[in-house]
Interface confidence: low
Amino acid sequence: LSVQQGPNLLQVRQGSQATLVCQVDQATAWERLRVKWTKDGAILCQPYITNGSLSLGVCGPQGRLSWQAPSHLTLQLDPVSLNHSGAYVCWAAVEIPELEEAEGNITRLFVDPDDPTQNRNRIASFPG
């Protein structure tokens, strides 16, 4: 089982849409797959997929999940708020037939404030 997550870095404006993609590859066929998205270590959602269907469509605040067989899990945040900034990780585990798990790399989401003044101040606050 392997999980590839993207993009590594995503910078979007407040009020727009952010799309995080997780590709789950498994050599053998599975009957039930558990998936999980976390933000800064906290679980946003932990649905399972069976017969090509997600058990849950909502994932955290303003988050929508979709599954495109055979391997693509998408988390769509719309509209994006400043609170959505953080480190997102996709995790997957085959539960049936064989218990096996894998985790993606971090996607760092940066949300720019809608107010250009706030945006300028925020960028200036970075060290260096």
Epitope: E95, P97, L99, E100
Partner: antibody, heavy 126, light 108 residues
């Protein structure tokens, strides 16, 4: 409440085959959410998972690499039990052998050994 | 292959004291697949904690589990006489499904 009843000889000669059986009550060996495991424990190796059998529309087996070439775990649906066979045993295989069940919980991805047999001490000696 | 290392090997405490047992994985593991077992002489192991922090059915709330990544902890808030035993951690995501070598909690 699942109960697991172990049976089999306590003494096996070196190079011979160790055979143990685990009878299940309170669940079915063909359950779509359970798996049926063998685990052993010795002072030198500690607790060691050996392998399992489970049914998910068809039968699957999964073995620890350390014993994969020597063991077979088979279900017996007619008797609702499963067995362990380990061939070419040596004194290093002397241990307490346990059967145990684990279950996939619908509400989470956790899976764990929740029911155990009482254990069978198997001594490999001539 | 994941290796689980438990510490200390032996913990000598008195009834009523707090016990803190550590389990360290050789690589990061999902907390969803970390369990703790208790074993008394002549008995099979008994499941205490699964998913790193969920208590199994019938386990008193003085037992608690925590941790993530590579470091996991079993805490017994106030030791009762029946709690003196050997405790094992185990990782059960995929195979093999390794156990730690155990921590013995003995009466001081």
């Amino acid at each position: 409440q699942v109960q697991l009843q172990q049976s089999g000889p306590g003494l096996v000669k070196p190079s011979q085959t160790l055979s143990l059986t685990c009878a299940i009550s309170g669940d079915s060996v063909s359950s779509n959410s359970a798996a049926w495991n063998w685990i052993r424990q010795s002072p030198s190796r500690g607790l060691e998972w050996l392998g399992r059998t489970y049914y998910r529309s068809k039968w699957y087996n999964d073995y620890a690499v350390s014993v994969k070439s020597r063991i077979t775990i088979n279900p017996d649906t007619s008797k609702n039990q499963f067995s362990l066979q380990m061939n070419s045993v040596t004194p290093e295989d002397t241990a307490i052998y346990y059967c145990a069940s684990d279950v996939v919980l619908e509400s989470s991805s956790s899976r764990h050994f929740d029911y155990w047999g009482k254990g069978t001490l198997v001594t490999v000696s001539s | 292959e994941i290796v689980l290392t438990q510490s200390p090997g032996t913990l000598s405490l008195s009834p009523g004291e707090r016990a803190t047992l550590s389990c360290r994985a050789s690589q990061s593991v999902s907390s969803s697949y970390l369990a703790w077992y208790q074993q008394k002489p002549g008995q099979a192991p008994r499941l205490l904690i699964y998913g790193a922090s969920s208590r199994a059915t019938g386990i008193p709330d003085r037992f608690s589990g925590s941790g993530s990544g590579t470091d996991f902890t079993l805490t017994i808030s106030r030791l009762e006489p029946e709690d003196f035993a050997v405790y094992f951690c185990q990782h059960y995501g995929g195979s093999p499904r390794p156990f730690g070598q155990g921590t013995k909690v003995e009466i001081k």
